[in-house]
Protein backbone atom coordinates (compact mmCIF):
# COMPACT_ATOMS: atom_id res chain seq x y z
CA UNK A 1 0.00 0.00 0.00
CA UNK A 2 2.81 2.41 0.88
CA UNK A 3 4.54 1.79 -2.47
CA UNK A 4 1.29 2.36 -4.34
CA UNK A 5 0.66 5.54 -2.36
CA UNK A 6 4.17 6.77 -3.11
CA UNK A 7 3.66 6.27 -6.83
CA UNK A 8 0.38 8.15 -6.73
CA UNK A 9 1.47 10.94 -4.40
CA UNK A 10 5.05 12.17 -4.66
CA UNK A 11 4.44 14.33 -1.58
CA UNK A 12 4.43 11.25 0.65
CA UNK A 13 8.19 11.04 0.13
CA UNK A 14 8.80 14.45 1.68
CA UNK A 15 10.26 13.93 5.18
CA UNK A 16 9.64 15.96 8.33
CA UNK A 17 11.34 19.32 8.10
CA UNK A 18 10.27 19.76 4.48
CA UNK A 19 7.10 20.50 2.57
CA UNK A 20 5.83 19.41 -0.81
CA UNK A 21 6.23 22.52 -2.94
CA UNK A 22 3.45 22.71 -5.54
CA UNK A 23 5.11 25.75 -7.08
CA UNK A 24 8.21 23.68 -7.84
CA UNK A 25 6.71 20.56 -9.38
CA UNK A 26 6.07 18.96 -6.00
CA UNK A 27 9.73 18.99 -5.00
CA UNK A 28 10.45 18.55 -1.28
CA UNK A 29 11.62 21.97 -0.11
CA UNK A 30 13.06 22.71 3.34
CA UNK A 31 10.77 24.57 5.72
CA UNK A 32 11.52 28.31 5.62
CA UNK A 33 13.01 29.98 8.71
CA UNK A 34 10.67 30.15 11.72
CA UNK A 35 8.53 27.28 10.46
CA UNK A 36 8.48 23.51 10.89
CA UNK A 37 6.83 20.27 9.78
CA UNK A 38 6.77 17.49 12.35
CA UNK A 39 5.52 14.78 9.98
CA UNK A 40 6.29 13.72 6.43
CA UNK A 41 4.11 14.43 3.42
CA UNK A 42 3.15 17.94 4.50
CA UNK A 43 2.07 20.45 1.84
CA UNK A 44 2.88 23.40 4.09
CA UNK A 45 5.10 24.10 7.09
CA UNK A 46 3.56 25.46 10.30
CA UNK A 47 4.68 28.78 11.76
CA UNK A 48 6.81 28.35 14.89
CA UNK A 49 5.29 29.41 18.18
CA UNK A 50 6.84 32.60 19.56
CA UNK A 51 7.40 32.78 23.30
CA UNK A 52 7.05 36.48 24.14
CA UNK A 53 5.85 38.65 26.97
CA UNK A 54 5.33 36.46 30.01
CA UNK A 55 6.24 33.37 27.99
CA UNK A 56 9.87 32.36 27.70
CA UNK A 57 11.45 29.80 25.40
CA UNK A 58 11.98 26.39 26.94
CA UNK A 59 12.89 24.73 23.64
CA UNK A 60 13.80 26.48 20.40
CA UNK A 61 11.86 25.77 17.23
CA UNK A 62 13.58 23.45 14.76
CA UNK A 63 12.65 22.44 11.24
CA UNK A 64 10.92 19.34 12.63
CA UNK A 65 9.43 20.51 15.94
CA UNK A 66 7.64 23.55 17.32
CA UNK A 67 9.08 25.80 20.00
CA UNK A 68 8.00 25.08 23.57
CA UNK A 69 7.30 27.85 26.07
CA UNK A 70 7.13 28.09 29.82
CA UNK A 71 6.38 31.08 32.05
CA UNK A 72 8.67 33.72 33.45
CA UNK A 73 9.36 33.57 37.24
CA UNK A 74 6.32 34.67 39.23
CA UNK A 75 3.96 32.89 36.83
CA UNK A 76 3.03 29.27 36.16
CA UNK A 77 1.78 27.37 33.13
CA UNK A 78 -1.84 26.51 32.47
CA UNK A 79 -3.40 24.49 29.69
CA UNK A 80 -2.01 22.00 27.21
CA UNK A 81 1.52 22.89 26.11
CA UNK A 82 1.59 25.89 28.45
CA UNK A 83 -0.98 27.79 26.40
CA UNK A 84 -1.43 30.33 29.22
CA UNK A 85 0.54 31.81 32.08
CA UNK A 86 -1.12 32.64 35.40
CA UNK A 87 0.51 34.78 38.05
CA UNK A 88 1.67 33.28 41.34
CA UNK A 89 0.52 34.52 44.71
CA UNK A 90 2.13 34.05 48.11
CA UNK A 91 1.29 31.08 50.30
CA UNK A 92 -1.78 32.01 52.30
CA UNK A 93 -3.35 33.74 49.30
CA UNK A 94 -5.40 32.93 46.23
CA UNK A 95 -5.62 34.66 42.87
CA UNK A 96 -8.88 36.46 42.10
CA UNK A 97 -9.86 38.97 39.45
CA UNK A 98 -8.93 41.61 42.03
CA UNK A 99 -5.42 40.21 42.27
CA UNK A 100 -3.88 38.12 45.06
CA UNK A 101 -6.07 38.08 48.18
CA UNK A 102 -5.44 36.57 51.62
CA UNK A 103 -7.26 33.35 52.47
CA UNK A 104 -10.37 33.91 54.58
CA UNK A 105 -10.30 32.69 58.19
CA UNK A 106 -10.79 28.94 58.26
CA UNK A 107 -9.12 28.36 54.92
CA UNK A 108 -5.51 27.91 53.81
CA UNK A 109 -3.28 27.62 50.76
CA UNK A 110 0.17 26.11 51.14
CA UNK A 111 1.11 26.76 47.50
CA UNK A 112 1.78 29.78 45.28
CA UNK A 113 -1.10 28.77 43.02
CA UNK A 114 -4.61 27.37 43.38
CA UNK A 115 -7.39 28.28 45.75
CA UNK A 116 -7.75 28.55 49.50
CA UNK A 117 -9.21 25.33 50.94
CA UNK A 118 -11.05 24.79 54.23
CA UNK A 119 -9.11 23.53 57.22
CA UNK A 120 -9.63 19.86 57.97
CA UNK A 121 -12.51 19.33 60.40
CA UNK A 122 -10.84 17.10 62.96
CA UNK A 123 -14.09 16.42 64.84
CA UNK A 124 -15.55 14.63 61.81
CA UNK A 125 -13.03 11.87 62.51
CA UNK A 126 -13.57 12.07 66.25
CA UNK A 127 -10.23 13.78 66.71
CA UNK A 128 -9.16 17.04 68.29
CA UNK A 129 -7.07 19.90 66.91
CA UNK A 130 -3.45 19.37 67.89
CA UNK A 131 -2.02 22.35 65.96
CA UNK A 132 -4.17 25.27 64.88
CA UNK A 133 -4.46 26.10 61.21
CA UNK A 134 -3.17 29.29 59.60
CA UNK A 135 -3.65 30.94 56.22
CA UNK A 136 -0.67 28.91 54.97
CA UNK A 137 -1.16 25.61 56.80
CA UNK A 138 -3.93 23.14 57.53
CA UNK A 139 -4.72 22.16 61.10
CA UNK A 140 -3.01 19.09 62.51
CA UNK A 141 -5.43 16.62 64.04
CA UNK A 142 -4.52 14.56 67.06
CA UNK A 143 -6.28 11.85 69.04
CA UNK A 144 -9.25 12.96 71.07
CA UNK A 145 -8.52 13.19 74.81
CA UNK A 146 -10.70 10.15 75.43
CA UNK A 147 -8.52 8.09 73.09
CA UNK A 148 -5.32 8.91 74.92
CA UNK A 149 -4.02 5.89 76.75
CA UNK A 150 -0.68 5.66 78.57
CA UNK A 151 2.14 5.59 76.07
CA UNK A 152 -0.03 6.60 73.13
CA UNK A 153 1.11 9.79 71.44
CA UNK A 154 0.42 9.26 67.75
CA UNK A 155 -0.42 12.25 65.60
CA UNK A 156 -2.67 11.79 62.59
CA UNK A 157 -1.54 13.88 59.62
CA UNK A 158 -4.25 15.96 57.97
CA UNK A 159 -6.27 14.42 55.17
CA UNK A 160 -4.68 14.83 51.72
CA UNK A 161 -5.53 18.20 50.23
CA UNK A 162 -8.08 18.21 47.45
CA UNK A 163 -6.87 19.27 44.01
CA UNK A 164 -7.57 22.98 43.62
CA UNK A 165 -10.42 23.49 41.21
CA UNK A 166 -8.98 26.88 40.30
CA UNK A 167 -6.51 26.13 37.56
CA UNK A 168 -7.22 23.60 34.82
CA UNK A 169 -3.92 21.97 33.97
Amino acid sequence: FERTRSLQDPCSNCPAGTFCDNNRNQICSPCPPNSFSSAGGQRTCDICRQCKGVFRTRKECSSTSNAECDCTPGFHCLGAGCSMCEQDCKQGQELTKKGCKDCCFGTFNDQKRGICRPWTNCSLDGKSVLVNGTKERDVVCGPSPADLSPGASSVTPPAPAREPGHSPQ
Epitope: G53, V54, L78, G79, S83, M84, C85, E86, Q87, L95, T96, K97, H166, S167, P168
Partner: nanobody, 123 residues
Framework: EVQLVESGGGLVQPGGSLRLSCGAS????????MLWFRQAPGKGLEWVAN????????YYVDSVKGRFTISRDNAKNSLYLQMNTLRAEDTAIYYC????????????????WGQGTTVTVSS
Protein backbone atom coordinates in the same frame (compact mmCIF):
# COMPACT_ATOMS: atom_id res chain seq x y z
CA GLU B 1 -2.09 36.60 13.33
CA VAL B 2 -3.22 37.33 16.89
CA GLN B 3 -1.36 40.46 17.97
CA LEU B 4 -1.24 43.18 20.63
CA VAL B 5 0.76 46.37 20.09
CA GLU B 6 1.33 48.91 22.87
CA SER B 7 2.12 52.59 22.37
CA GLY B 8 2.13 55.87 24.29
CA GLY B 9 5.12 55.37 26.58
CA GLY B 10 7.74 58.03 27.11
CA LEU B 11 9.55 60.27 29.57
CA VAL B 12 7.37 62.24 31.98
CA GLN B 13 8.03 64.29 35.11
CA PRO B 14 6.74 63.20 38.53
CA GLY B 15 3.11 64.28 38.90
CA GLY B 16 2.59 64.14 35.14
CA SER B 17 0.24 62.03 33.04
CA LEU B 18 0.47 59.56 30.18
CA ARG B 19 -2.07 57.52 28.26
CA LEU B 20 -1.01 54.09 27.03
CA SER B 21 -2.83 52.39 24.17
CA CYS B 22 -2.92 48.76 23.11
CA GLY B 23 -4.20 47.87 19.66
CA ALA B 24 -5.54 44.35 19.15
CA SER B 25 -5.84 42.41 15.91
CA UNK B 26 -6.46 38.85 14.74
CA UNK B 27 -9.15 37.98 17.30
CA UNK B 28 -12.56 39.09 18.54
CA UNK B 29 -11.38 41.72 20.99
CA UNK B 30 -14.80 42.22 22.62
CA UNK B 31 -14.88 38.57 23.77
CA UNK B 32 -11.90 38.75 26.11
CA UNK B 33 -10.84 40.17 29.44
CA MET B 34 -7.81 42.41 28.96
CA LEU B 35 -5.01 43.21 31.39
CA TRP B 36 -2.08 45.56 31.95
CA PHE B 37 1.14 44.35 33.57
CA ARG B 38 4.41 46.17 34.19
CA GLN B 39 8.03 45.30 34.85
CA ALA B 40 10.18 47.79 36.72
CA PRO B 41 13.96 47.69 36.18
CA GLY B 42 15.42 44.66 37.96
CA LYS B 43 12.00 43.52 39.20
CA GLY B 44 9.49 40.84 38.22
CA LEU B 45 6.30 41.31 36.25
CA GLU B 46 3.50 42.92 38.26
CA TRP B 47 -0.22 42.91 37.47
CA VAL B 48 -1.53 46.48 37.22
CA ALA B 49 -5.18 46.33 36.15
CA ASN B 50 -7.77 44.29 34.30
CA UNK B 51 -11.10 44.92 32.61
CA UNK B 52 -13.90 42.60 31.54
CA UNK B 53 -15.36 42.24 28.07
CA UNK B 54 -17.81 45.15 28.16
CA UNK B 55 -15.83 47.40 30.51
CA UNK B 56 -18.25 47.09 33.42
CA UNK B 57 -15.69 45.44 35.74
CA UNK B 58 -12.31 47.03 36.42
CA TYR B 59 -9.73 46.09 39.04
CA TYR B 60 -6.40 47.60 40.07
CA VAL B 61 -3.36 46.79 42.15
CA ASP B 62 -3.43 48.87 45.36
CA SER B 63 -0.42 50.99 44.41
CA VAL B 64 -2.19 52.55 41.38
CA LYS B 65 -5.77 52.83 42.68
CA GLY B 66 -7.12 56.37 42.25
CA ARG B 67 -4.29 57.29 39.85
CA PHE B 68 -4.63 54.86 36.93
CA THR B 69 -7.76 54.12 34.89
CA ILE B 70 -8.16 51.15 32.56
CA SER B 71 -10.66 51.41 29.72
CA ARG B 72 -11.43 49.89 26.36
CA ASP B 73 -13.10 50.75 23.06
CA ASN B 74 -14.39 47.55 21.49
CA ALA B 75 -15.33 49.36 18.28
CA LYS B 76 -11.67 50.33 17.85
CA ASN B 77 -10.22 47.05 19.20
CA SER B 78 -8.24 49.12 21.68
CA LEU B 79 -7.30 48.97 25.36
CA TYR B 80 -6.11 52.02 27.30
CA LEU B 81 -4.35 52.89 30.54
CA GLN B 82 -4.69 56.49 31.68
CA MET B 83 -1.90 57.18 34.19
CA ASN B 84 -2.12 60.32 36.33
CA THR B 85 0.00 61.66 39.21
CA LEU B 86 2.90 59.52 38.05
CA ARG B 87 5.66 58.63 40.49
CA ALA B 88 9.25 57.50 40.03
CA GLU B 89 8.21 54.00 41.14
CA ASP B 90 5.85 53.77 38.14
CA THR B 91 8.90 53.63 35.85
CA ALA B 92 8.60 50.31 34.00
CA ILE B 93 7.89 48.54 30.76
CA TYR B 94 4.10 48.27 30.45
CA TYR B 95 2.54 45.27 28.71
CA CYS B 96 -1.02 44.61 27.66
CA UNK B 97 -2.19 41.01 27.70
CA UNK B 98 -5.26 39.00 26.79
CA UNK B 99 -7.05 36.89 29.36
CA UNK B 100 -7.28 33.31 28.11
CA UNK B 101 -10.57 31.55 27.32
CA UNK B 102 -12.40 31.05 30.61
CA UNK B 103 -10.59 33.89 32.36
CA UNK B 104 -12.23 34.74 35.73
CA UNK B 105 -14.39 31.59 35.63
CA UNK B 106 -11.88 28.77 35.86
CA UNK B 107 -8.52 30.52 35.85
CA UNK B 108 -6.73 33.86 35.58
CA UNK B 109 -4.28 32.92 32.85
CA UNK B 110 -3.10 35.14 29.98
CA UNK B 111 -2.27 33.84 26.53
CA UNK B 112 -1.29 36.76 24.28
CA TRP B 113 1.10 39.59 25.15
CA GLY B 114 2.35 42.69 23.42
CA GLN B 115 5.98 43.73 23.12
CA GLY B 116 5.69 46.43 25.80
CA THR B 117 6.08 50.21 25.93
CA THR B 118 8.53 51.99 28.24
CA VAL B 119 7.40 54.59 30.76
CA THR B 120 10.09 56.63 32.54
CA VAL B 121 9.11 58.98 35.36
CA SER B 122 11.98 61.30 36.17
CA SER B 123 12.71 64.95 36.77
Amino acid sequence: EVQLVESGGGLVQPGGSLRLSCGASGFTFSSYWMLWFRQAPGKGLEWVANINQDGSEKYYVDSVKGRFTISRDNAKNSLYLQMNTLRAEDTAIYYCARGGDGYSNSHFGTDVWGQGTTVTVSS
